[in-house]
């Protein structure tokens, strides 16, 4: 197999929240909102790296369930990856569990932009390789 190297900052995956179990309450340094825990990332990562980072924290890349949640998250952070992508510009936007994503995503006509980002209270398509802040979510 090929060798994988990932550069870890102290604030990155090597935190004590990495293996945190979510037993009815949120781990330290996580935010609680509407029965979910949110990890507010400080480092910029690509969409796929963000996905892995959240998995390592026993959580998922940010998902948006409703407008209120979107407004709440926009106050916390100006932009963040969300767990929504498409397999090409001819395919629908889907969530990580394969369900069609029901909210509108701006700039969807650009074939190179196949991952979604929450940016100031709206959803936009972005280049999956862009380095953007990520947030993780775990439902209690």
């Amino acid at each position: 197999p090929s060798t994988l190297i990932q550069r870890h900052n102290n604030s990155s995956l090597n935190t004590r929240t990495q293996k945190a179990r979510h037993c009815g309450h949120c781990p330290e340094e996580w935010i609680t909102y509407s029965n979910s825990c949110y990890y507010i990332g400080k480092e910029r990562r690509t969409w796929e790296e963000s996905l892995l980072a959240c998995t390592s924290k026993n959580s998922s890349l940010l998902s948006i369930d409703n407008e209120e949640e979107m407004k709440f998250l926009s106050i916390i952070s100006p932009s963040s990856w969300i767990g929504v992508f498409r397999n090409s510009s001819h395919h629908p936007w889907v969530t990580m569990n394969g369900l069609a994503f029901k909210h509108e995503i701006k700039d969807s006509d650009n074939a190179e932009l196949n991952c979604a980002v929450l940016q100031v209270n709206r959803l936009k398509s972005a280049q999956c390789g862009s380095s953007i802040i990520y947030h993780c979510k775990h439902k209690l």
Partner: antibody, heavy 121, light 107 residues
Framework: QVQLVESGGGLVKPGGSLRLSCAAS????????MSWIRQAPGKGLEWISY????????YYADSVEGRFTISRDNAKNSLFLQMNSLRAEDTAVYYC??????????????WGQGTTVTVSS | DIQMTQSPSSVSASVGDRVTISCRAS??????LAWYQHKPGKAPKLLIY???SLQSGVPSRFSGSGSGTAFTLTISSLQPEDFATYYC?????????FGGGTKVEIK
């Protein structure tokens, strides 16, 4: 237009070192994962290394692991391959390539013309 | 590692012929397969991505099919500029691996 131009190839003795560069233009380099691929004389294509746009994730093929180092400078739109402890079997044309835009899909949609590395005494 | 086996290794054909190249993966790779065209001294060119999607700017005579372990590249009507070596590549996981190549030569 979108372009990748490799440089730095040449003749080097076994055990020697060489640093390859790849200059990118016509696209936002900092948004793309990049790879190095090589082709030995009379052989097929061999992927050797990969780096994410954030510089956080790096992969190497077993054949070069521990000897080659991939890096990038997003401010200068440049990709690099530092090659140490070179062997005769490293003789090849080296290509830099840009990963495509689809998540989970590791194809390469833009390639450079290649730079030739010859390892011989 | 995922091994990619291409066949045939070479094919002689005439302009206007239909050419089919096969590629087999040693394990399932879903639709994560790419096809490239490579001419001597030139940059390899992506033709097909995600097994069957035509890359922008590539003529429609090129098509790809298959999923899982068996894939096919078809050139419906061979043109003079199509004489080259074609490679498949599994785009599913690291290390990325290529087929051995198929050289399409003039008959």
């Amino acid at each position: 237009q979108v372009q990748l131009v490799e440089s730095g190839g040449g003749l080097v003795k076994p055990g020697g070192s060489l640093r390859l560069s790849c200059a990118a233009s016509g696209f936002t380099f900092s948004d793309f994962y990049m790879s190095w691929i090589r082709q030995a004389p009379g052989k097929g294509l061999e992927w050797i290394s990969y780096i994410s746009s954030s510089d956080f994730t790096i992969y190497y093929a077993d054949s070069v692991e521990g000897r080659f180092t991939i890096s990038r400078d997003n401010a200068k739109n440049s990709l690099f391959l530092q090659m140490n402890s070179l062997r005769a079997e490293d003789t090849a044309v080296y290509y830099c390539a840009r990963r495509g835009s689809l998540p989970f899909n590791y194809d390469m949609d833009v390639w450079g013309q290649g730079t030739t590395v010859t390892v011989s005494s | 590692d995922i091994q990619m086996t291409q066949s045939p290794s070479s094919v002689s054909a005439s302009v206007g012929d239909r050419v089919t190249i096969s590629c087999r993966a040693s394990q399932g790779i879903s639709s994560y397969l790419a096809w490239y065209q490579h001419k001597p001294g030139k940059a390899p060119k992506l033709l097909i991505y995600a097994a069957s999607s035509l890359q922008s700017g590539v003529p429609s005579r090129f098509s790809g099919s298959g999923s899982g372990t068996a894939f096919t590249l078809t050139i419906s009507s061979l043109q003079p500029e199509d004489f080259a070596t074609y490679y498949c590549q599994q785009a599913n996981s690291f290390p990325l691996t290529f087929g051995g190549g198929t050289k399409v030569e003039i008959k």
